[in-house]
């Protein structure tokens, strides 16, 4: 049979996924009902690996399957009559497929830094990069992340800095390629703890007895993590800046000369069954030397005739030592002083001078 | 075939609100961050707001701040943009487009916005 | 804020000539550079961004370069469909910027 050439293809129109594009097209000729059509589909850069797919018969649409994420392809499609007569042009268009969403993403604290580390391995096919969206309330912030090669498996991170500590922030990674986005993967993670800032004041101190004083002190700034505990710490020395160093100091060893700095009293402030708010200041009033126990600290009677200065450790993490029991690590703790209190200067105990005066 | 259609623009008075809006298709709307960029006649390019897929964080040149608020309804395919507090300085052709990695890839007709007495 | 500084504001080229277009940001913006054309009436059209070496349906005759705070458009062999008022922009940090334009005539 003799047949005319088919006039060209117009029209097409093509719906993508992640691996597949779904073409349809048009041909306007009388005979067109008896075409197939033939259609080479070419990955951008790659024109030795070409796709066909032929059609069945008056079929103008066709599936394209097993391509690559976020990647460019060209198809030509010729309209083809009886023996292989085809259209002088292929009708041709350029598509994307869309680009694969990130499977998931890990956050990690960075230790004493209100940062975050994020990290991923690259979602299938070809990208341009990646949006980040980092919120928190009403704060946010929206960056670039450069492009990755999901060939070798290869884990990649970045680091999110200049957050604040002890924070829920959401988290959205969104893939870009061939000017589409992904949809975005989402996650909630929240920043790590430091040292509480230390406060601006220091603690009240007043002679009770001869041998007992009450301590009065505001709790800590709770913006570098939620406060665990608090220490009240004696000295009778020159107060200089307290270290983490005097925490492992006890009644005991002031007794016995070992130091004449030592912890007399501890709090546990989960203790006190509510949480905390950024704003919400406790006031706290300890009676010191009245021989409680608290964990490995003794809060024993004073000199009288003493001289006593009080200052109060913070801790945001309390790490107790594995051979100490229940004395403070303060390497291993996070942890931040006050200044120490002005001096107290205890009286005589009048029952001993009485005593005396009498014999 | 992507298509972004804006509508709302017309003539305001100083002072007086409007709001925009721009009706998306033929793609996932959901998954993109778009924006608004506008063009005072004769003049060039000013970009205006713009607003995050995942958690729809929005961001404004200092100019509209406090004044003008971007949002957009995911189920609708729509994006917009309430103006308040109108100046004649806000007089332009307002388009929305996508926005991925800072680059505005597809742009709508336009509106446009006359601030006037 | 970061400034574009395009260059030339106009220029006027012959059929088949080629010709370049800069664009100077104030600071350092890691590629993320875009061009559009736009044409009288018409919204702007994304030539290329750092995203899209050349965007989808734009001719091969135009190329962009640059890194750092320099970066320019060539345009090959030009056509008379390519007149129009041509712009940079910056998506590297909020707010979004774009240069002034760049008036390109046929001769």
């Known amino acids: 049979a003799q047949y005319t050439r088919p006039s060209n293809v117009s029209n097409i129109d093509v719906s993508t996924n992640t691996t597949a594009a779904t073409l349809s097209w048009q041909n306007f000729d009388d005979a067109s009902p008896t075409y197939s059509y033939c259609l080479l589909i070419e990955k951008a850069g790659n024109s030795s690996n070409a796709t066909q797919v032929v059609t069945d018969i008056g079929i103008t649409d066709a599936t394209v399957t097993e391509l690559i994420p976020g990647s460019s392809y060209t198809v030509e499609i010729f309209a083809q009559v009886g023996d292989g007569i085809k259209s002088l042009e292929p009708g041709r268009k350029s598509f994307c497929t869309d680009p694969a969403s990130m499977a998931s993403f890990d956050c990690e604290v960075v230790p004493k830094e209100p940062a975050l580390v994020l990290k991923w391995t690259c979602p299938p096919g070809a990208n341009a990069g990646f949006e980040l969206e980092v919120s928190s309330g009403a704060w946010n912030n929206a960056t670039h992340l450069e492009s990755c090669s999901s060939e070798n498996g290869t884990e990649y991170r970045t680091e999110v800095t200049y957050l604040n500590f002890s924070t829920s922030y959401n988290i959205s990674i969104t893939t870009v390629s061939c000017g589409k986005m992904a949809a975005p993967t989402r996650n909630t993670c929240t920043t790590g703890i430091t040292d509480p800032p230390p406060p601006d004041g220091s603690p009240n101190i007043t002679s009770v007895s001869h041998n007992s004083v009450k301590v009065k002190f505001s709790g800590f700034e709770a913006s570098h993590g939620p406060i665990k505990a608090y220490a009240v710490i004696l000295t009778t020395g020159e107060a200089g800046h307290p270290s983490a160093d005097v925490l492992k100091y006890t009644y005991e060893d002031f007794k016995k000369g070992a130091s004449d700095t030592y912890v007399t009293y501890l709090i546990r402030t989960e203790e006190k069954g509510r949480s905390q708010s950024l704003s919400e200041v406790l006031k706290y009033e300890i009676d010191v030397g009245n021989e409680s126990t608290t964990l490995g600290y003794y809060n024993g009677k004073l000199e009288p005739l003493g001289s006593y200065r009080a200052c109060v450790a913070g801790f945001t993490n309390i790490t107790f030592h594995p051979q100490n029991k229940g004395l403070i690590d303060g390497a291993e703790s996070y942890v931040s002083f006050s200044r120490y209190s002005d001096a107290v200067s205890l009286p005589q105990d009048v029952a001993a001078a009485h005593h005396h005066h009498h014999h | 075939e992507v298509k972004l259609v804006e509508s709302g623009g017309g003539l305001v008075q100083p002072g007086r609100s409007l709001k925009l809006s721009c009706a998306a298709s033929g793609f996932t709307f959901s998954n993109y961050y778009m924006a608004w960029v506008r063009q005072a006649p004769t003049k060039g390019l000013e970009w205006v707001a713009y607003?995050?897929?995942?958690?729809?964080?929005?961001y404004y040149r200092d100019s509209v701040k406090g004044r003008f608020t971007i949002s957009r309804d995911n189920a609708k395919s729509t994006l917009y943009l309430q103006m308040d507090s109108l100046r004649s300085e806000d007089t332009a052709t307002y388009y929305c487009?996508?926005?991925?990695?800072?680059?505005?890839?597809?742009w709508g007709q336009g509106t446009l916005v006359t601030v006037s007495s | 804020d970061i400034q574009m500084t395009q260059t030339p504001h106009s220029l006027s080229a012959s059929l088949g000539e080629t010709v370049s277009i800069e664009c100077l940001a104030s600071?350092?913006?890691?590629?993320?550079l875009a061009w559009y054309q736009q044409k009288p009436g018409k919204s702007p059209q994304l030539l290329i961004s750092?995203?899209?070496p050349l965007h989808d349906g734009v001719p091969s005759r135009f190329s962009g370069s640059g890194s750092g705070t320099q970066y320019s458009l060539k345009i090959r062999n030009m056509q008379p469909e390519d007149e129009g008022v041509y712009y940079c922009q910056q998506g590297y940090k909020f707010p979004y910027t774009f240069g002034a334009g760049t008036k390109l005539e046929l001769k």
């Open positions: 750092h995203a899209n």
């Open positions: 600071e350092g913006i890691s590629n993320y």
């Open positions: 487009s996508t926005v991925p990695l800072g680059a505005f890839v597809y």
């Open positions: 607003i995050t897929n995942g958690y729809g964080s929005t």
